[in-house]
């Protein structure tokens, strides 16, 4: 089930997911001057089962100045998630997919991809927040948000995070040192059942994740 809106905005903070839950959709977006190939995929979809998940459909872009005649690939659609928008900075190291069954890691970039990624999240998606560089986190509770279904409507839980204007970058759960890089981190999804085990896995993933390629933007 798609989440009807975006994760909450926290002043001076960005969010990311550790992995994308099955059903997450990533729109096929092309950079200026390029377009999706004719009959190409509309979006990529995280699909699979509890033991193995992967992204279906390959996004492909071609020059707007030419006819859509190259690299035609029949798309394989899949389920969508609530949208998330990110701006690509540089290639990231993918999370070990096996560590979160039923989830997909960040899909690799495609040729002539747009500078921002638009995800559609599904119920159960969890995202983590961190303060942007130059701000320090004051935690009142978990710095995360989960998309939940209540009485037939979706909502995101409110992350308990305040970012204060101190020259120290806060970290994701499990991180103790300030980030060396000013860049944000990739967004992903995690299990919708927030158990202790889930949280530990997610925390470990966050702690070991390399500096990411994405800085979240809110539309």
């Amino acid at each position: 089930e798609l989440c009807d809106d975006d994760p909450p905005e926290i002043p001076h903070a960005t969010f990311k997911a550790m992995a994308y839950k099955e059903g997450t959709m990533l729109n096929c977006e092309c950079k200026r001057g390029f377009r999706r190939i004719k009959s190409g995929s509309l979006y990529m979809l995280c699909t699979g089962n509890s033991s193995h998940s992967s992204w279906d459909n390959q996004c492909q872009c071609t020059s707007s100045a030419t006819r859509n005649t190259t690299k035609q690939v029949t798309p394989q659609p899949e389920e969508q998630k609530e949208r998330k928008t990110t701006e690509m900075q540089s290639p990231m190291q993918p999370v070990d997919q096996a560590s979160l069954p039923g989830h997909c890691r960040e899909p690799p970039p495609w040729e002539n991809e747009a500078t921002e990624r638009i995800y559609h999240f599904v119920v159960g998606q969890m995202v983590y927040y961190q303060c942007v560089q130059g701000y320090r986190a004051l935690h009142r509770g978990p710095a995360e948000s989960v998309c939940k279904m209540t009485h037939g409507k979706t909502r995101w839980t409110q992350p308990q995070l305040i970012c204060t204007g101190e020259m120290e970058t806060s970290q994701f759960p499990g991180e103790e040192k300030p980030q060396a890089s000013p860049e944000g981190r990739p967004e992903s999804e995690t299990s919708c059942l927030v158990t202790t085990t889930d949280f530990q896995i997610q925390t470990e993933m966050a702690a070991t994740m390399e500096t990411s390629i994405f800085t979240t933007e809110y539309q």
Epitope: E1, N27, S41, Y43, L45, P77, E79, R83, V122
Partner: antibody, heavy 118, light 110 residues
């Protein structure tokens, strides 16, 4: 709750032009593909085409390509279906629908009835 | 592209189960798992009942189930109720990046 709001019923003469609309929520409309589906009186559903309001990329069913035009206005979060020259056979209910999970249409407008008669 | 093939009508008594079949080709139903089913009551817009062959959106009764074998998909409604009386349409994504609907099946609850 996400809703697609369609424009009201239209009565036109053959040869006239027409543009009907489908308005979606401001926060997400431009990020979802919007399809148009025709249903003639007493008949079944026919997929006409689909458009991405974010960049106006459109795909058409071979049956409808060349006879209708899909467009969108991002600032108005509205998608449009238009004809430059209507025919009596265009008389039908037209639905817009959001492309959701697994390439299924998860949210539908209530439809716009178009009657073309001389 | 040709419409998917569905029976024009099916009927059943309250409490019974009925199955509606939807036959396509290897370019649509057989080639993808992107088969969905829609319910349409008279004068109303269609409503998504099943997607991805067998998944149910929230709010849809578990009396509705879907499956697929080869080029044929099926919708089964168990414990038939009066409010199930409606038209049902299958749909599939196709190899040409378009969609195709079935001709529709009118379900009558006797």
């Amino acid at each position: 709750e996400v809703q697609l709001v369609q424009s009201g019923a239209e009565v036109k003469k053959p040869g006239e032009s027409l543009k009907i609309s489908c308005k979606g929520p401001e926060y997400s409309f431009n990020r979802y593909w919007i399809a148009w589906v025709r249903q003639r009186p007493g008949k079944g559903l026919e997929w006409m085409g689909i458009i991405y309001p974010g960049d106006s990329d459109a795909r058409y069913s071979p049956t409808f390509e060349g006879h209708v035009t899909l467009s969108a206005d991002m600032s108005l979060t509205t998608a449009y279906l238009q004809w430059s020259s209507l025919r009596a056979s265009d008389t039908a209910m037209y639905y817009c629908a959001r492309l959701g999970s697994y390439y299924a249409f998860d949210i539908w407008g209530k439809g716009t009835m178009v009657t073309v008669s001389s | 592209q040709s419409a998917l093939t569905q029976p024009a009508s099916v009927s059943g008594s309250p409490g019974q189960s009925i199955t509606i079949f939807c036959t396509g080709t290897s370019s649509d139903v057989g080639g993808y798992n992107y088969v969905s089913w829609y319910q349409q009551h008279p004068g109303k817009a269609p409503k998504l009942m099943i997607y991805d062959v067998s998944k149910r959106p929230s709010g849809v009764s578990n009396r509705f189930s879907g499956s697929k074998s080869g080029n044929t998909a099926s919708l089964t409604i168990s414990g038939l109720q009066a409010e199930d009386e409606a038209d049902y349409y299958c749909s599939s994504y196709t190899s040409s990046s378009t969609w195709v609907f079935g001709g529709g099946t009118q379900l009558t609850v006797l």
